[in-house]
């Protein structure tokens, strides 16, 4: 098994992740591991020399870069917040602030916007990843209600009056809870004709 630097006639290297083809010398050389950069380029007589990234800089992958990338903070003006700090091996990890979704994506989220409200009777469909897209409002399922205009409110189950020793005064809808009353209270006049004797 050849150790870099080694000759390459077909311009490809055995380990594409950790080696690269250097065209001037027509050889395969080592890439630098994450958290480092090339401080001296390889040649036929010596392999790549790597050095650790300085503070506030990083390289995420095996590379043959002659510089490290500058760490960037999460921009609150763009609706972003930090979830993990920058290290020599990883850029700052950002996400959309609560109540926001990613509106512009270029390899990573660059701009977040406020989530749209879901009207009463609906709730935001749950997504695999929070903040990935705007709300898609879906109707509350049977036996549930939601009575606000909100980006995050969830449909709640209708109250079961009997569980509280009460009786149903008015059935719940998608936008309102069941109305309960004390069984000794008279029915409202508009409902008096519907009582079972």
């Amino acid at each position: 098994q050849a150790v870099p630097p080694y000759a390459s006639e077909n311009q490809t290297c055995r380990d594409q992740e950790k080696e690269y083809y250097e065209p001037q010398h027509r050889i395969c050389c080592s890439r630098c591991p994450p958290g480092t950069y090339v401080s001296a380029k390889c040649s036929r007589i010596r392999d790549t020399v790597c050095a650790t990234c300085a503070e506030n800089s990083y390289n995420e992958h095996w590379n043959y870069l002659t510089i490290c990338q500058l760490c960037r903070p999460c921009d609150p003006v763009m609706g972003l917040e930090e979830i993990a700090p920058c290290t020599s091996k990883r850029k700052t990890q950002c996400r959309c602030q609560p109540g926001m979704f990613c509106a512009a994506w270029a390899l990573e989220c660059t701009h977040c916007e406020l989530l749209s409200d879901c009207p009463p009777g609906t709730e935001a469909e749950l997504k695999d990843e929070v903040g990935k897209g705007n709300n898609h409002c879906v109707p509350c399922k049977a036996g549930h209600f939601q009575n606000t205009s909100s980006p995050s409110a969830r449909c709640q189950p209708h109250t079961r009056c009997e569980n509280q020793g009460l009786v149903e005064a008015a059935p719940g809808t998608a936008q309102s809870d069941t109305t309960c009353k004390n069984p000794l209270e008279p029915l409202p006049p508009e409902m008096s004709g519907t009582m079972l004797m």
Partner: antibody, heavy 120, light 107 residues
């Protein structure tokens, strides 16, 4: 038979430009890295420029970087050296050469050379 | 840049003599050294590559040796056609650099 024939040399004033050519024959030109070397009167040899087989990569020593441009036309089996901002110290015989295609990287064939004189 | 120091710069010898020319590199060049012969108004011609290997068509009286930083070209028995200038070239690391040359003259 492998042949490399340079042309385009001549007398040029300081600051002027010149384009050298090297016509290749007897081998598959597009498979080889090509080079220009030079030799000043009564002096030793000096590397001037390199171009990769497909022409994507070019390399120069600091002495000519930014002033000289190597190029090639594989369809015409031709190598070129565009020289600009010429100086008196660029006066030399210019040779094109082929780099061996294996793993030893020596220069197995050279042209006969073309003379460039930079003088006012 | 890797400095190549070639010696002697000139040498007088007779037909039949054994001649040795040396090249010292500024650092280990791992045998990426070739030797060239040049006659007046002619192009250089490859003699030895990878420090010790004889190029095609080159007479066996020419040989190369050495490793690391020190390399030698030997002509075992000089012939009249061998009077020329000889250059070593390191091509281990760009920029490629030549020795200053050794002019071999008839004594």
């Amino acid at each position: 038979e492998v042949q490399l024939v340079e042309s385009g040399g001549g007398l040029v004033k300081p600051g002027g430009s010149l384009r050298l050519s090297c016509a290749a024959s007897g081998f598959t030109f597009s498979d080889y890295y090509m080079y220009w070397f030079r030799q000043a009167p009564g002096k030793g040899l000096e590397w001037v420029a390199t171009i990769s087989d497909g022409g994507s990569y070019t390399y120069y020593p600091d002495s000519v970087k930014g002033r000289f441009t190597i190029s090639r036309d594989n369809a015409k089996n031709s190598l070129y050296l565009q020289m600009s901002s010429l100086r008196a110290e660029d006066t030399a015989v210019y040779y094109c050469a082929r780099e061996e295609n294996g793993n030893f990287y020596y220069f197995d064939y050279w042209g006969q050379g073309t003379t460039v004189t930079v003088s006012s | 840049d890797i400095q190549m120091t070639q010696s002697p710069s000139s040498l007088s010898a007779s037909v039949g003599d054994r001649v040795t020319i040396t090249c010292k590199a500024g650092q280990d060049i791992k045998s990426y050294l070739s030797w060239y012969q040049q006659k007046p108004w002619k192009a250089p011609k490859i003699l030895i590559y990878y420090a010790t290997r004889l190029a095609d068509g080159v007479p066996s009286r020419f040989s190369g040796s050495g490793s690391g930083t020190d390399y030698t070209l030997t002509i075992s028995s000089l012939q009249p056609e061998d009077f020329a200038t000889y250059y070593c070239l390191q091509h281990g690391e760009s920029p490629w650099t030549f020795g200053g040359g050794t002019k071999l003259e008839i004594k």
